[in-house]
Every structure is written in C-alpha cells, then in structure tokens.
C-alpha cells in the first residue's frame, strides 16, 4: 500500500505510478517540459527528495477527450 | 565509445580522508542518475550512494551515511565522492556506474575501478 | 532493506552445459531484477535487466526468467568466454541489493 510522503525509488515507484494512475498512464516528466528519458522529474522529486500522493497524481497522463 | 573513469585510490590510515574522480565520456553525462558501487577483497558487489542528473539530491548506503558524499560537476563531466572517517571495513575497489533509471535501474556502464587501502 | 540470495554459490561446468543459476529475493520485486558478469580483475558487466530483457550486445545464449521472488539466469550453451562470477541485483527500492554472487568454473 501506498505510504503517504515518502521517498519511492526504483521499481517502486513505477508500481506506485501504475497503481495511482491507473488507465491513465504516467509521464516521468511532466508533459509541459516533454516526455523525455532523461534523470529528472519523478525520479529527483520523487526517490531523491520525499513524494506524497498529491505529487504522484501530477505525472499522471491525462486521458484523451472523447468528441 | 561510452567511458567511464576512476582515480584516487590509495592507502590510507584509519580515520582519514580520501576523495575519488571518475571522468565520464561518450554519453550526455549530465542526463543520468550516477552511482558508486563497491567490492572488498574476494566479496561481493555493494551500492554505496547514488546522485540525480541535476547534482541537487543524494541517496547513500547506511554503512557510509555522514561519511561519505558523493558530488559532480556536469561542466566537467565527472562524478566524485569525498570518503572522510575512513575505516578497514572501506577497503575495496570503488567503481563509478551510470544508471539506466527507466529502464529498470540497471548500471549499464561500469568504470575500471579504484583500489582503497584503508590500514595502519 | 531486500536480502538477496543466490544458489548455487559455486558450481563447475563444461563447455557446451545447460547451466541454471536461481536468485531470490526476501520480498516480492515484480520484475526489477538485473544480472551482471564479473571476469577476475574487471569490472561487472550487465548481461539482463528487467528479469529477462538482454542487454544490447549480450549473446543469445543468455536468457533470464522470473518475477516476484524467484529468478533464473540460463545459459544455454556454456562457451570458454562464460567462465566467471554472476551477481543478480534488485532495481525495486534503495538501496539497490546485490546477491553474494555465483562462481562458475571450468570443470
């Protein structure tokens, strides 16, 4: 279960994500700075520093809109 | 050719200080989480600290917590850690690595490692 | 901290053997689970990550298999070059464990 303000790291934190986020899917960046591969976003805010589940949410995919 | 490589190593006396360099090329160096990881003599692998891409945020093993830090400079492409309060139980080969943080935390290169000697 | 295991922690082969190496991990770590290659004197070098994905430039006959606690590293067809220490390594949560390692020797 998920531990609020803690730090989440490795495998973890992707279960974490994938559990928070649902269908949704995650970015490991926000989608305003790109999705990118690179070692920032989620894993600094997240493993490095503590990440509660307001924090989590943010890297959620929103889904697409339906016409 | 993707590279990494250490210095620094040496002997020294119990209690002192050591400060290890590993001087990364062929990789956008500062896009990766950085790790130090080592080997005492005829033993095992151990992880010992880790640092974000940025350089703002660290992660260390509890047997060198206070220790030990671990600090890079992306403008020069190098990842260091400072070893201070040095004890016999350090001896090892230090080895610097690059982490392949999504793709399942792997190291996926390695340096050629450093020998430290700490004895009296 | 996850404890991790490995069996067997020597184990002699010939050239051309099926050999079987099991980690184990003290809780469930779905698949976050890496092998490395050690030869005397160098550096570890990754064969899989993620349980079972082979690394860029790693031979065929290495596979990996196994998720939760349990994991296999195979070696399908053991050549002169295979001979050395294999570690496993948990990718699930700081600090990232490693296993006490698996000589494997020429018989």
């Known amino acids: 279960a998920y531990r609020p303000s803690e730090t989440l790291c490795g495998g973890e934190l992707v279960d974490t994500l994938q559990f928070v986020c649902g269908d949704r899917g995650f970015y490991f960046s926000r989608p305003a700075s790109r999705v990118s591969r690179r070692s920032r976003g989620i894993v600094e805010e997240c493993c490095f520093r503590s990440c509660d589940l307001a924090l989590l949410e943010t890297y959620c995919a929103t889904p697409a809109k339906s016409e | 050719e993707v590279q990494l490589l250490e210095s620094g190593g040496g002997l020294v006396q119990p209690g002192g200080s050591l400060r290890l360099s590993c001087a990364a090329s062929?990789?956008?160096?500062?896009?990766?989480?950085m790790a130090w990881v080592r080997q005492a003599p005829g033993k095992g692998l151990e992880w010992v600290s880790s640092?974000?891409?940025?350089?703002?945020?660290?992660k260390y093993a509890d047997s060198v917590k206070g220790r030990f830090t671990i600090s890079r400079d992306n403008s020069k492409n190098t990842l260091y850690l400072q070893m201070n309060s040095l004890r016999a139980e350090d001896t090892a080969v230090y080895y610097c690595?690059?982490?392949?943080?999504?793709?399942?935390?792997?190291?996926?290169?390695w340096g050629q490692g450093t020998m430290v000697t700490v004895s009296s | 901290d996850i404890q991790m295991t490995q069996s067997p922690s020597s184990l002699s082969a010939s050239v051309g053997d099926r050999v079987t190496i099991t980690c184990r991990a003290s809780?469930?770590?779905?698949?976050?689970l890496n092998w490395y290659q050690q030869k005397p004197g160098k550096a570890p070098k990754v064969l899989i990550h993620?349980?079972?994905t082979l690394e860029s430039g790693v031979p065929s006959r290495f596979s990996g298999s196994g998720s939760a606690t349990e994991f296999t590293l195979t070696i399908s067809s053991l050549q002169p070059e295979d001979f050395a220490t294999f570690y496993c390594?948990?990718?699930?949560?700081?600090?990232?464990?490693f296993g006490p390692g698996t000589r494997l020797s020429s018989k």
């Open positions: 993620a349980a079972s």
């Open positions: 390594q948990q990718s699930y949560s700081v600090p990232f464990t």
């Open positions: 062929g990789f956008t160096f500062s896009e990766y989480v």
């Open positions: 809780q469930s770590i779905n698949t976050y």
């Open positions: 640092i974000v891409s940025s350089g703002g945020y660290t």
């Open positions: 690595a690059k982490d392949m943080t999504y793709s399942g935390d792997a190291f996926d290169v």
